[in-house]
């Protein structure tokens, strides 16, 4: 009634190991570690077999297979790359996952390692089971932006991809009778958002209540450079459109919005965000200098007030840059309180420009980012927004274009970028 | 075409309510706020108050608040003013508007008569 | 609140004169920041709704003739006819949109 010796598998054991075995006796049969039982194409972890009253085992040894992670998720924005030679997905195998560079970089700056675990998992130290998450990368154009330049006065055409958060925001409104039409410029900042000034989106009454606009009459493009030319451009339509609910249209206070795209847009040479500032009520340095893009009036010797009596919103072609120093609050509130007109630079605004005049943003140029380069971080920030200018001529000695002060409003931004109201998309990195 | 029919001439006695009537057509009735003027026989204008469709945001003329309560159906295009304990001085016509004041209504007369 | 006080209260003129009439405001109604005056011009004929006839000081509705002309700024406004015809016979009010609306008290147009 003695059953035949054993054969532990390959890769496994057999407890308990006994010279004899006799009618009744049973074995468990388990494998190494990262390595399963496979009995009838089934797996298992163990498997129990017993010594029969004929002197034969109930059934056969079973083999020990190598635990298969199987083919790795994809990763959005990512990609991922087998550090084992044949492509192994099996027990000890690795892989890295890597973001789309230069346009993602990986959250928390994993190493993006993951190993196939004992339990068939692809595994990573930190994320554990989780995959990583690809971000965009912002303030990073693919080229670099130009360390001196001389409406947008007194500015210059932009290369393509000099400023790729910029956006062009053109509100067609058909509620109105007649239609109403008009743009101004914004700022990425991530696949789903867009960064501008409240009265662009302001519905143009001829009262002064705020209103937004319909998300329906508002379309945004991306990529563009020439407005002639919008082949090349990305366009979309809105989801939402948030102004700040404290937008005051007598004295342009929380002059701030947000555009949720109804599609997150491809990031690219052409199309990338940029970065939002430490939430900071300093704002920028007096001195400090900006660059800002526009594809507002460029024409120095067209009036400001003959565009306005025209009812043309006359446009450059081309996308214009310029560069301009920040002024001192100080300086900037006692210019506009020597203006007659109830002009308040508030604490949530800063100005830039030349007291002699010359450069500047004007009418069109509305809800761009005044960016600053972060030498500590080596991005490009959105510290400003086109907001308004004084009652003289874009461009007029003494009178400083006046921009939204980003750092006051991140919390706000941050909130309505990821509160249950919007429509859900994807995450954004503080 | 644009248009706004208000509902006919009402005839009310004092403390009592009326409840009058403008139907929109012929343009996004949601995107622009309705007003609404009140006219005493003889006399000038005076604004009540408006209501925006979209979300139903009201504001009103202080000296209406407790007087006039605004409201629409979007379904309809419609909206309504509610006036309240009514008294002589309410005895005027009252106008609709809309696209800020583009077009209105033909007017409603409300006589408030034991 | 903003208060609307229009002058003269009703004139007579002959049709193709000029007509000029005035409407002064409380307050400034001028928005720096939007280089707009919010303020507008009815006209109100006998028996029917008022028309709007300009908007922001001196934009004129479409459809409204060349003859009406809006001007002014801050506190003070004017509305012009050019030349009256005998159809612009009407109750002519200004309104205020600077804050919440208020209608001045007219200025009742006839033709001798």
């Known amino acids: 009634n003695e059953c035949p010796k054993l054969q532990p598998p390959v890769y496994g054991k057999i407890e308990p190991s006994q010279a004899v075995y006799s009618f009744k006796d049973q074995v468990l049969v388990s494998c190494d570690t990262g390595y399963k039982v496979l009995k009838d194409n089934g797996v298992m972890d163990t498997f129990q077999i017993e010594c029969l009253k004929d002197g034969a085992w109930s059934n056969k040894i079973p083999t020990c297979k190598i635990v298969d992670c199987g083919a790795p998720a994809g990763l959005k924005h990512g990609l991922v790359t087998f550090s084992t030679r044949n492509n192994l997905t099996t027990y000890k195998s690795e892989i890295r996952y890597s973001c789309q560079q230069p346009y993602y970089k990986m959250l928390h700056n994993t190493t993006g390692v993951y190993t196939c675990s004992a339990h068939g998992t692809w595994t990573n130290e930190v994320l554990k089971r989780s995959l990583p998450t690809c971000l965009p990368v912002c303030g990073q154009p693919s080229r670099a932006l130009p360390n001196l330049v001389k409406r947008i006065i007194g500015g210059r055409n932009a290369e393509l991809g000099l400023f790729p958060w910029q956006a062009l925001i053109v509100v067609e409104d058909t509620s109105r009778v007649p239609n109403d039409k008009w743009f101004g410029s914004g700022a990425l900042l991530s696949e789903s958002w867009i960064l501008t000034a409240a009265h662009v989106l302001r519905s143009q009454r001829r009262d002064n209540t705020v209103i937004p606009v319909s998300k329906e009459h508002v379309t945004v493009y991306l990529g563009l450079h020439d407005v002639r030319d919008k082949s090349g451009a990305v366009n979309s339509s809105a989801a939402r459109v948030i102004l700040h609910p404290d937008f005051n249209i007598q004295n342009y206070n929380h002059d701030i919005a947000l555009v949720q795209l109804q599609k997150p847009v491809p990031l690219g040479a052409h199309v990338m965000p940029i970065c939002l500032p430490r939430p900071e009520p300093e704002g920028p340095a007096p001195h400090m200098l900006g660059l800002v893009a526009g594809w507002g009036i460029s024409n120095p010797n067209v009036t400001v007030d003959e565009i306005i009596l025209s009812g043309t919103r006359t446009l450059s072609d081309v996308l214009q840059y310029v560069k301009l120093p920040v002024v001192s609050h100080a300086e900037c509130k006692a210019s506009y309180e020597s203006r007659s007109g109830n002009y308040s630079v508030t604490e949530n605004m800063f100005c830039a420009g030349y007291y002699e005049g010359g450069k500047d943003t004007c009418l069109g140029d509305s809800g761009g980012a005044f960016v600053i380069f972060d030498e500590m971080s080596q991005h490009w920030v959105a510290q400003g927004l086109v907001s308004w200018g004084g009652p003289e001529e874009c461009g007029s000695k003494q009178v400083y274009g006046v921009y939204t002060k980003v750092s006051n409003y991140v919390d706000w931004l941050w909130e309505e970028m990821n509160s249950p109201r919007a429509v859900r998309d994807l995450q954004v990195e503080r | 075409q644009v248009q706004l029919k208000q509902s006919g001439p009402e005839l009310v006695k004092p403390g009592a309510s009326v409840k009058l009537s403008c139907k929109a057509s012929g343009y996004t009735f949601t995107s622009n706020d309705i007003n609404w003027v009140k006219q005493r026989p003889g006399q000038g204008l005076e604004w009540i108050g408006w209501i925006y469709p979209r979300d139903g945001t009201t504001k009103y003329n202080e000296k209406f608040t407790d007087k006039a309560t605004l409201t629409v159906d979007v379904s309809s295009s419609t909206a309504f003013m509610e006036l309240h304990r009514l008294t002589s001085e309410d005895s005027a016509v009252y106008f609709c508007?809309?696209?800020?004041?583009?077009?209105w209504g033909q007017g409603t007369l409300v006589t408030v008569s034991s | 609140d903003i208060v609307m006080t229009q002058s003269p209260s009703s004139l007579a003129v002959s049709a193709g004169e000029k007509v000029t009439m005035s409407c002064k405001s409380s307050?400034?109604?001028?928005?720096?920041?939007?280089?707009?005056?919010?303020l507008s011009w009815y006209q109100q004929k006998p028996g029917q709704s008022p028309k709007l006839l300009i908007y922001w000081a001196s934009t004129r509705e479409s459809g409204v003739p060349d003859r009406f002309t809006g001007s002014g700024s801050g506190t003070d406004f004017t509305l012009t006819i050019s030349s009256v015809q005998a159809e612009d016979l009407a109750v002519y009010y200004c309104k205020q949109s600077y804050n919440l609306y208020t209608f001045g008290g007219g200025t009742k147009l006839e033709i001798k």
């Open positions: 307050q400034s109604l001028l928005i720096s920041r939007t280089r707009k005056n919010y």
């Open positions: 508007s809309s696209v800020e004041d583009s077009y």
